[in-house]
Interface confidence: low
């Protein structure tokens, strides 16, 4: 049977009553159209919700939006387009809502034809109240925020400009023209680059990159012959034509560009890309794409400069450039990634890592399921996620992988149980320790949402039909209840809860549909009084993560260390809580093999910690470049994982010789970079 | 016990320099993101510099910047404040202090005295 | 840089009085405010964080509260060992900045 039928399943007391004082209805006074919703702040509770509806007219489109506001997580909304005196905004470029809790929202309205320029409304004050601002340009993006300082926003416009203002959007100024991409890094820098022959596209490949630390006051070039760049936990990324052909490398720098080094990492053609998969202090995941339409490409790991690389997992299927591939960060579990591959069969298969990518498996089969027709053997077969690339195909797919950082463990994803993906109908399938053990959770897709940072999840079930009812489930997926919040089922469009998972409030969004009319509606839903008192001390349990084999002295070491979580007992029906802080207790690992990655020439063969040299490049000599230099690299094949922690143990010991010798291939030298001031 | 001890303070002369350590003990050292901040003769504080748990990020008030540098150890559980270039205005008790993961400044060394005169 | 105002600069108080700090904001801060304790050759003390949250702890006599650019940090029934200094600081953006403190002395 599935899971919550099962008679053991304890039920939640007078739940029905509980939830019913708690659920609100809004009816928004709104023709169908489209919304879109946007929290503005942590554990503010404020809400902005933007409807906009197209009338083709015959000559041109009518548009009209209007914006409402809830300020106690959606139970109640306030109709406040007034506050931006009836103005249709643009919703292609959604509520640009400032970082942290700085409480600001930059919206963008539409303006007429003839116009010099476009128009935005700002708020600081968490949407209580709006200022117009005529723009001296026509944005062809959306305000950016610089991540240190919410004062600052930059903004490309419609002619290629890069402008810039200082205080929230109240004063623009253009600090560059010729501009195809602009980006914010650290300390209130901007990263662009520029063209000189005309256009952005015309000039793939021979742009500039540029850099002023100073918001427009002094520039530098950074780079020449750029196609494109990137920024990623504290790297920066540029993909650099080859001077004799139409090839290109990447190349890293850790100094805001003052800098640059080659990474270790195969070229691409023309028709290849390069993709940053994730990124963060330590370290880079990097996919370059294989030659040809394949459709997949491999991942690599990079040390902690970002320079040298080592082959982390083949045929990582991600399709062409900007398109779809399931790497999914498990935000749950430190060191965590999911992905598929796309085997020599054209099958696509799920595999995780544990290790910040040093070695991937197959995810166990669940113990509660059968393998389905794609298994050569009944009893031998795996669990395959669903993500990004089954809902770009259009599969019965309605939600990505979910994990929570504060509800440690938890991953809920739709999944099928073979050899690899079926586009049969999905099922819904939880890990409680992030991804080693699986179990069916719910029967067929659904939507779902973490809340109370694990404390409660809650799904509604996917389905053409409307619908009334809503699961919840306090012990992590085990056991499920029903709640009809509505007697009129409403046309589902989704879920919505605050970011964070730390909310017991979840909004139900739907229309309704009459002979005459649709309208927006959305159900709010107050989850507290079934969660009614706070928990304790008795209410945790102490949780070793990583852990595989519990006699094992070394048992949880994950890069170099361990950690013991507190977690909240299952059958504990309580609340962690707003304030709730995830408890843990690290402790350091002696290091081993796994606490080192294959270096640069070295690869591991399946089954085995061991490295080995690539047969090909046996017997010569590895040279990279290092900030410009040509560098000799001396190593018995190992280098420690970027964040690994371990100390004493297994120590391989790995030295790099400093040749002196000019890079001929780096086309970022120091030399050739300048300087101007405004 | 969670304890922070500050020490490296001194008499130094302007345009001099001087080398502020903080050892710490009693937390996981190496999970905390660490500040300095100092607090003038007239009791008025100034937050200084900021360095992450990893140590990748760092940032500083304007005050400070390109003269002082924030560093750690954690291996050694210690937290470094290099200050060249130092100016009478520098004179101050310069405290280490803990980020956790509610807020900036939930534990606090007992400061050390640095004084810049001729 | 936010600025921020801490009145007043002292109070008098006695044993079991209700006292109150403010501290104004020169921008909203939404709750990115804390409350610190210094006592003379004491280390600085969390009271306070987020506006409103007790650290572990702290007496419960403490309380904050306020959001946006105003808040507030009262001491419902002032005790013998509350004699202090006492400081809010902003961790909304950087630079992150202090109150110029308010000095809690006896009657």
């Known amino acids: 049977s599935a899971p919550g039928e099962d008679e053991e399943c304890g039920r939640v007391r007078d739940f029905v009553a509980k939830l019913a004082n708690n659920t609100h209805q809004h009816v928004f006074d709104d023709l169908r159209g489209s919304v879109s919703l946007s929290w503005v702040g942590d554990s503010t509770g404020v809400i902005l919700v933007l409807t906009t509806f197209h009338v083709p007219l015959v000559i041109m489109t009518f548009g009209q939006s209007k914006l409402y506001r809830s300020e106690d997580y959606g139970k109640n909304f306030k109709d406040i387009t007034d506050l931006i005196n009836n103005t249709f905004i643009r919703t292609e470029f959604g509520m640009a809502i400032g970082p942290e809790n700085s409480g600001k929202v930059v919206l963008t309205a539409e303006v007429s034809g003839g116009s010099r320029g476009g128009r935005i409304f700002r708020s600081s004050d968490f949407a209580k109240n709006f200022v117009q601002t005529d723009l001296p340009f026509h944005p062809l993006t959306q305000m950016m925020y610089s991540p240190q300082n919410s004062d600052y926003l930059l903004a490309l416009s419609t002619e290629n400009g890069l402008w810039v203002s200082k205080n929230f959007g109240g004063k623009w100024e253009e600090i560059h023209k010729a501009v195809c991409l602009a980006k914010w890094g650290s300390d209130n820098t901007i990263f662009f680059t520029t063209y000189a022959n005309g256009s952005c596209k015309a000039d793939l490949g021979a742009l500039e990159l540029w850099r002023t630390s100073d918001l427009g006051k002094s520039f530098k070039t950074i780079g020449v012959k750029i196609y494109s760049f990137g920024l990623g936990g504290r790297f920066l990324f540029a993909s650099v034509m080859a001077d004799k052909d139409t090839t290109r490398r990447i190349h890293v720098s850790t100094d805001q560009g003052d800098t640059w080094s080659m990474a270790q990492l195969p070229s691409v053609g023309q028709e290849q890309f390069y993709s940053i998969l994730a990124a963060n202090d330590d370290m880079v995941f990097m996919h370059v794409d294989e030659p040809g339409d394949t459709g997949f490409g491999t991942i690599f790991t990079s040390d902690d400069r970002g320079i040298v690389y080592s082959k982390s997992l083949d045929r990582h299927l991600y399709t062409t450039t900007g398109g779809e591939t399931d790497f999914t960060n498990v935000t749950s579990l430190r060191g965590v990634y999911i992905t598929s591959v796309l085997s020599e069969d054209n099958s696509i298969q799920t595999m995780i890592t544990f290790d910040q990518g040093g070695r991937w498996t197959h995810l166990r089969k669940p113990e509660n399921s059968e393998c389905d027709a794609t298994a050569k053997n009944k009893n031998e077969c795996s669990l395959h996620i669903h993500a990004s690339y089954s809902i770009s195909q259009k599969l019965n797919v309605p939600m990505a992988p979910l994990s929570e950082p504060n509800a440690v463990g938890i991953v809920i994803a739709h999944g099928s149980v073979g050899d690899a993906i079926s586009v049969m109908v999905p099922d819904v399938y939880i890990s409680d320790d992030g991804g080693y053990s699986w179990t069916k959770m719910l029967e067929g897709p659904h939507y779902y949402t973490i809340l109370d940072s694990g404390g409660i999840i809650v799904a509604i079930e996917h389905s053409s039909r409307p619908i009334n009812v809503i699961k919840f489930s306090t012990d992590e997926g085990q056991c499920w209840q029903t709640y009809t919040f509505t007697r009129d089922p409403i046309y589902f469009t989704g879920l919505a809860s605050e970011p964070g998972a730390r909310s017991m409030n979840i909004s139900i969004w739907g229309f309704t549909e009459s002979f005459l009319t649709s309208q927006w509606v959305s159900y709010t839903i107050d989850f507290k009084d079934i969660l009614e008192r706070n928990c304790e001390e008795k209410d945790y349990t102490i949780w070793l993560a990583h852990s595989t084999d519990p006699e094992d002295y070394e048992d949880g070491c994950i890069l170099g260390y361990k950690e013991q979580f507190l977690r909240l007992r299952k059958s504990s029906v309580c609340q962690n809580g707003r304030d709730y802080v995830v408890t843990k207790q690290p402790s350091i690992c002696l290091c081993s093999l796994e606490d080192f990655l294959c270096d640069f020439g070295y690869y591991r063969p399946e089954n085995d910690s061991k490295c080995v040299e690539q047969p090909e490049l046996k017997g010569h000599d590895l040279e990279f470049c290092l900030y410009g230099r040509e560098e000799h690299l001396t190593t018995n094949g190992y280098r420690k994982i970027p964040g690994d922690k371990c100390q004493g143990g297994v120590n391989p010991v790995r030295e790099v010789k400093d040749l002196k010798k000019k890079c001929t291939s780096n086309f970022l030298s120091p030399e050739k970079q300048n300087s101007k001031s405004n | 016990e969670v304890q922070l001890v500050e020490s490296g303070g001194g008499l130094v002369q302007p345009g001099g320099s001087l080398r502020l350590s903080c050892a710490a003990s009693g937390f996981t050292f190496s999970t905390y993101g660490m500040s300095w901040v100092r607090q003038a003769p007239d009791k008025r504080l100034e937050w200084v510099a900021i360095i992450s748990s990893g140590g990748s990020y760092t940032y500083y008030s304007d005050t400070v910047k390109g003269r002082f540098t924030i560093s750690r150890d954690n291996s050694k559980n210690s937290l470094y404040l290099q200050m060249n270039s130092l100016k009478a205005e520098d004179t101050a008790v310069y405290y280490c202090?803990?980020?956790?993961?509610?807020?900036?400044?939930?534990?606090w060394g007992q400061g050390t005295l640095v004084t810049v005169s001729s | 840089d936010i600025q921020m105002t801490q009145s007043p600069s002292s109070v008098s108080a006695s044993v079991g009085d209700r006292v109150t700090i403010t501290c104004h904001a020169s921008?909203?801060?939404?709750?990115?405010i804390g409350w610190l304790q210094q006592k003379p050759g004491k280390a600085f003390k969390g009271l306070i964080y987020?506006?409103?949250n007790l650290k572990d702890g702290v007496p419960s006599r403490f309380s904050g509260s306020g959001s946006g650019a105003d808040f507030t940090l009262t001491i419902s029934s002032l005790q013998p060992e509350d004699f202090a200094d006492y400081f809010c600081?902003?961790?909304?953006?950087?630079?992150?900045?202090f109150g110029q403190g308010t000095k809690v002395e006896k009657r």
């Open positions: 987020h506006g409103t």
């Open positions: 921008q909203g801060i939404s709750s990115n």
């Open positions: 600081v902003q961790y909304a953006q950087f630079p992150y900045t």
């Open positions: 202090s803990r980020s956790s993961s509610h807020w900036y400044f939930d534990v």
